[in-house]
Amino acid sequence: AILGRSETQECLFFNANWERDRTNQTGVEPCYGDKDKRRHCFATWKNISGSIEIVKQGCWLDDINCYDRTDCIEKKDSPEVYFCCCEGNMCNEKFSYFPEMEVTQPTSNPVTPKPP
């Protein structure tokens, strides 16, 4: 392993759409991939009138946008669906929203998902 890099071997898995998609609803997903590729965890969620609804969590494969991120943080301003990714086992258990705004100071909106 490269010094300082968090190797991702497994991630929290969740699929709100599990019945339609015909998958598990929740569990721990082992992350596989080519030896030369990095592995990450991800989370996607929606904010419905202040209520957090998790859409999906699981493994995410070699994405430069996820490199060296130990925390799962969405930085886009008010997306329709929030997305974050990170490196490290089960790093997607918690996820946060820190919008990058040009003028105003970012506000912290940490999210700790309720167990399904």
Epitope: N24, P30, Y32, C59, W60, L61, D63, E80, V81
Partner: antibody, heavy 120, light 107 residues
Framework: EVQLLESGGGLVQPGGSLRLSCAAS????????MHWVRQAPGKGLEWVSS????????SYADSVKGRFTISRDNSKNTLYLQMNSLRAEDTAVYYC?????????????WGQGTLVTVSS | DIQMTQSPSSLSASVGDRVTITCRAS??????LNWYQQKPGKAPKLVIY???SRASGVPSRFSGSGSGTDFTLTISSLQPEDFATYYC?????????FGGGTKVEIK
């Protein structure tokens, strides 16, 4: 090297049956979900069916639901597609493909395809 | 079902040209967007996954961008081996759906 090799295609009459196979090698077959995708002559790609790593979950396109059955034998590293009540519109090249994660984030390896022709 | 709309359906270009293909989803698919290249008589080959990540062995002239509903595949300098049909595909939910394809032809 990852390899997927389909077989079992051929000419069949409307209402008939065929069983396609996809032999996998070069990776740990029982760790990956698998898919069937088809392509009618001169047309685009259409997803047909998927199965998770251990066969516990399966999913089908509405166009084949109730007629096609996807299955796998992890001891033989083989994926199957049982096709019954075949129609002319099922005529296509059928590809098997490997899913990269449990969420099928992408299909990273594909077989070369096998042609199914439904005609009287 | 999520509908994927690709444009253009075909284009003519010369070696060395910069080529851009767009794909629009009928609803937000975050970054669950993949691009495949297919040559006549051959199986599709993964080019870009997760909207922006190049698959193994894919040259750096291929790049992907976008998120939400609008996505782009760009070939910065078209090479002879790039003439093919390109498909986008969403994997946000089942059924997985593909765009209609863009055929890149020699001018």
């Amino acid at each position: 090297e990852v390899q997927l090799l389909e077989s079992g295609g051929g000419l069949v009459q409307p209402g008939g049956s065929l069983r396609l196979s996809c032999a996998a090698s070069g990776f740990t077959f029982d760790s990956y979900g698998m898919h069937w995708v088809r392509q009618a002559p001169g047309k685009g790609l259409e997803w047909v069916s998927s199965i998770n790593y251990n066969g516990g979950y399966t999913s089908y396109a509405d166009s084949v639901k109730g007629r096609f059955t996807i299955s796998r034998d992890n001891s033989k590293n083989t994926l199957y597609l049982q096709m019954n009540s075949l129609r002319a519109e099922d005529t296509a090249v059928y590809y098997c493909a490997r899913a990269a994660t449990w969420h099928d984030t992408h299909l990273d390896y594909w077989g070369q395809g096998t042609l199914v022709t439904v005609s009287s | 079902d999520i509908q994927m709309t690709q444009s253009p359906s075909s284009l003519s270009a010369s070696v060395g040209d910069r080529v851009t293909i767009t794909c629009r989803a009928s609803q937000s698919i975050v970054s669950y967007l993949n691009w495949y290249q297919q040559k006549p008589g051959k199986a599709p080959k993964l080019v870009i996954y997760a909207a922006t990540s190049r698959a193994s062995g894919v040259p750096s002239r291929f790049s992907g961008s976008g998120s939400g509903t609008d996505f782009t595949l760009t070939i910065s300098s078209l090479q002879p081996e790039d003439f093919a049909t390109y498909y986008c595909q969403q994997s946000y939910e089942n059924p997985l759906t593909f765009g209609g394809g863009t055929k890149v032809e020699i001018k």
